[in-house]
Amino acid sequence: SGLNDIFEAQKIEWHEVPRWRQQWSGPGTTKRFPETVLARCVKYTEIHPEMRHVDCQSVWDAFKGAFISKHPCNITEEDYQPLMKLGTQTVPCNKILLWSRIKDLAHQFTQVQRDMFTLEDTLLGYLADDLTWCGEFNTSKINYQSCPDWRKDCSNNPVSVFWKTVSRRFAEAACDVVHVMLNGSRSKIFDKNSTFGSVEVHNLQPEKVQTLEAWVIHGGREDSRDLCQDPTIKELESIISKRNIQFSCKNIYRPDKFLQCVKNPEDSSCTSEI
């Protein structure tokens, strides 16, 4: 298949970085990282007609070019620009779902509500979801032993900079009503230090985005509090309002029922508050 051709053509040999080299605090590059990225790219472009003209070999070249031979604490958004360009994707800008600390439910939702998109439903998000990667300065090796941890080592590491870059672009592309799913079980329902709070919120374009609608997902079955009144939600409302974007908030008291009603909106029990 296309994937075999790609590997045959270049006979990639990815050597592990020797154990005596720099040890970082975070886990190393995901096993079979190049193969995984290429396989995901091929699969995604086969499934999504608007991306079928994308050349996965070029995508991989751009991906590895962003971090190979570079110090893993000195990665910039510019390093990822070629990858961002090749992964440019026109998703319906009024169908964007952002999320913070509740990825699984957000993904379950877009798997059912097929016309809405999280970042991980786009090519670039899909390629990198749940993967770790880093290289080493002045060598073409991938470090499978350890990679920098955002807190303990450095923030400008390959994975963090990738997600910051791709999240910014995703938010910039949004329009009309943008939805965000927030985890009501956490002490900070809205966290200014999350990717949503530090990147996406500040890159929504007021000339294109009319409203940000937050869906606060409740954790306990008996939790009937109005979490839209939470101080951190009020903080989010304040940040959004100052950017001339309207804000609205909804409690999702029963996430299981919420998903069920997305699947079967005709169900008689779906008219009440979820």
Epitope: V54, S58, D61, G65, Q81, K85, L86, T90, P92, C93
Partner: antibody, heavy 123, light 110 residues
């Protein structure tokens, strides 16, 4: 002053090959995508291929150009090339190179163009 | 294939007239607004006028303006000047970093 200068155009027979050059001056090649765009006589514009070389070449092509056209770059000469093979009459056009600034606010449009070089495919 | 359709294909105007050119894309452009406009004079390369639908390129007179989003865009010249008689092209930016150009609109002297 930013300058892009195309050369290498001329008359070629159907099935023949030609290599176009785009020499850049007045800016650092490494921060820009260089895009080849063509314009058939009296017709509109059509993009052909793109290349960017911050560290290793990253290139991609319009669907119709894949296989017949190859873009490459010589950083030491600040020159981009377009190798065109199996040429057909419908490839007759003025071929322009243009630059696109590499940065998310700037990508997707071309702020500097060369003067173009004419390629005529005819027997 | 993505189609960008410009209308009209030819437009006759007098100096001082207000002129509007429309560009329709068969697919939404990236980010809803990633569309550029170029001006081309005979024997010359195109020149960037507008980018991201409504942003004026450096050195372009303020009589040029752009609007629109998604699939429908317009370029307006509020008061046509002698230097503005030329052909105008729209250009969209799409998935995978691909580009498409409109067929052009020739603005000629009435």
């Amino acid at each position: 002053e930013v300058q892009l200068l195309e050369s290498g155009g001329g008359l070629v027979q159907p099935g023949g090959s030609l290599r176009l050059s785009c020499a850049a001056s007045g800016f650092s090649f490494n921060n820009y995508w260089i895009i080849w765009i063509r314009q058939a006589p009296g017709k509109g514009l059509e993009w052909v291929a793109a290349i960017y070389s911050p560290s290793g070449d990253i290139k991609y092509y319009a669907d119709w150009a894949k296989g017949r056209f190859t873009v490459s770059k010589d950083n030491s000469k600040n020159t981009v090339y377009l190798q065109m093979n199996s040429l057909r009459a419908e490839d007759t056009a003025v071929y322009y190179c243009a630059r696109e600034l590499a940065g998310s606010s700037y990508e997707g449009y071309f702020e500097s163009w060369g003067q173009g070089t004419l390629v005529t495919v005819s027997s | 294939d993505i189609q960008l359709t410009q209308s009209p294909s030819t437009l006759s105007a007098s100096v001082g007239d207000r002129v509007t050119i429309t560009c329709r894309s068969s697919q939404s452009v990236y980010g809803h607004n990633w569309l550029a406009w170029y001006q081309q004079k005979p024997g010359k390369a195109p020149k960037l006028l507008m980018y991201r639908a409504s942003n004026l390129a450096s050195g372009v007179p303020s009589r040029f303006s752009g609007s629109g989003s998604g699939t429908e865009f317009t370029l307006t010249i509020s008061s046509v000047q002698p230097d503005d008689f030329a052909t105008y092209y729209c250009q969209g930016y799409y998935s995978g970093g691909s580009y498409a150009f409109g067929g052009g609109t020739k603005v000629e002297i009435k």
